[in-house]
Interface confidence: medium
């Protein structure tokens, strides 16, 4: 039964990757991994997302040998760096190779760091918001998604992606406005349920 569920999940991921493309898959992965590994830094999550996207692309294209190799490499990397990723990986990393990847994929969310600062400082109040967004849109939005997701393990990934899309749309509009800060100052109010 576990195998069937895992196989169904994989088919769903392949369908999503095919239908929505790599950028959307990466956004999904940033949100999910940030919830699961809230103590990992953004660069670490970015690396995992890049590697995971490669694994899924190969697995979905039927490159089964490459897929298995890269999946094993990713599990190895995660286990070798578990101190900077998550405190919940110990048991998974002690399992034999074939069970390791599946265990990591199902691992519970780590505890959130206690002293996370307000998101508003960097994504609303900073005078650099539009400059940072213009210089590296996807990285900036990725960091926003990471910061939001790690603070909200209770939110669905779909909701997190919707919030990130709202933020992106707001910046696209406001960064072209006469007074960008005035325009996006209340963006977080739109996120309240």
């Amino acid at each position: 039964d576990e195998g069937k569920a895992s196989s169904a999940k994989q088919r769903l991921k392949c369908a999503s990757l095919q239908k929505f493309g790599e950028r959307a898959f990466k956004a999904w992965a940033v949100a999910r991994l940030s919830q699961r590994f809230p103590k990992a830094e953004f660069a670490e999550v970015s690396k995992l997302v890049t590697d995971l996207t490669k694994v899924h692309t190969e697995c979905c294209h039927g490159d089964l040998l490459e897929c298995a190799d890269d999946r094993a490499d990713l599990a190895k990397y995660i286990c070798e760096n578990q101190d900077s990723i998550s405190s919940k990986l110990k048991e998974c990393c002690e399992k034999p190779l074939l069970e390791k990847s599946h265990c990591i994929a199902e691992v519970e969310n780590d505890e959130m760091p206690a002293d996370l600062p307000s998101l508003a400082a960097d994504f609303v109040e900073s005078k650099d918001v539009c400059k940072n967004y213009a210089e590296a849109k996807d990285v900036f939005l990725g960091m926003f998604l990471y910061e939001y997701a790690r603070r909200h393990p209770d939110y669905s990934v779909v909701l997190l992606l919707r919030l990130a899309k709202t933020y992106e749309t707001t910046l696209e509009k406001c960064c072209a406005a006469a007074d960008p800060h005035e325009c996006y100052a209340k963006v977080f109010d739109e996120f309240k349920p």
Partner: nanobody
Framework: QLQVVESGGGLVQAGGSLRLSCTTS????????MGWFRQAPGKEREFVAA?????????DYANSVKGRFTISRDNAKNTVYLQMNSLKPEDTAVYVC?????????????????WGQGTQVTVSS
């Protein structure tokens, strides 16, 4: 892991200038705030300057170096620079570069994850 390597230190007379460089490898540079810290013999490590990730036009300086030191970054070269003018003997220290993805800009050493080995700057009177 992100590797951090400093260069450009040396011996200079008071009133002179030096430009330190800090180059990173091993990870995408653009997601990191970069900072310079210094440690003089027998003293604690102290914050010198920091620059934000991405656009890099948000900077922060210790009061003791404001107006004399300028931090800048070149994302294409994975490099951050510290231009030091009007150097004083009390600027003598090992200057260490560090990278942080904890915050877009930080002056706190505990928010920096990756550190270089440092480069010695000696200012003679």
């Amino acid at each position: 892991q992100l590797q951090v390597v400093e260069s450009g230190g040396g011996l200079v007379q008071a009133g002179g200038s030096l430009r330190l460089s800090c180059t990173t490898s091993g990870r995408a540079f653009i997601g990191y705030a970069m900072g310079w810290f210094r440690q003089a013999p027998g003293k604690e490590r102290e914050f010198v300057a920091a620059i934000s990730w991405f656009a890099g036009d948000t900077t922060d300086y210790a009061n003791s170096v404001k107006g004399r030191f300028t931090i800048s970054r070149d994302n294409a070269k994975n490099t951050v620079y510290l231009q030091m003018n009007s150097l004083k003997p009390e600027d003598t220290a090992v200057y260490v570069c560090a990278a942080s993805s904890a915050r877009p800009l930080s002056s706190r050493s505990d928010e920096y994850h990756y550190w270089g080995q440092g480069t010695q700057v000696t200012v003679s009177s």
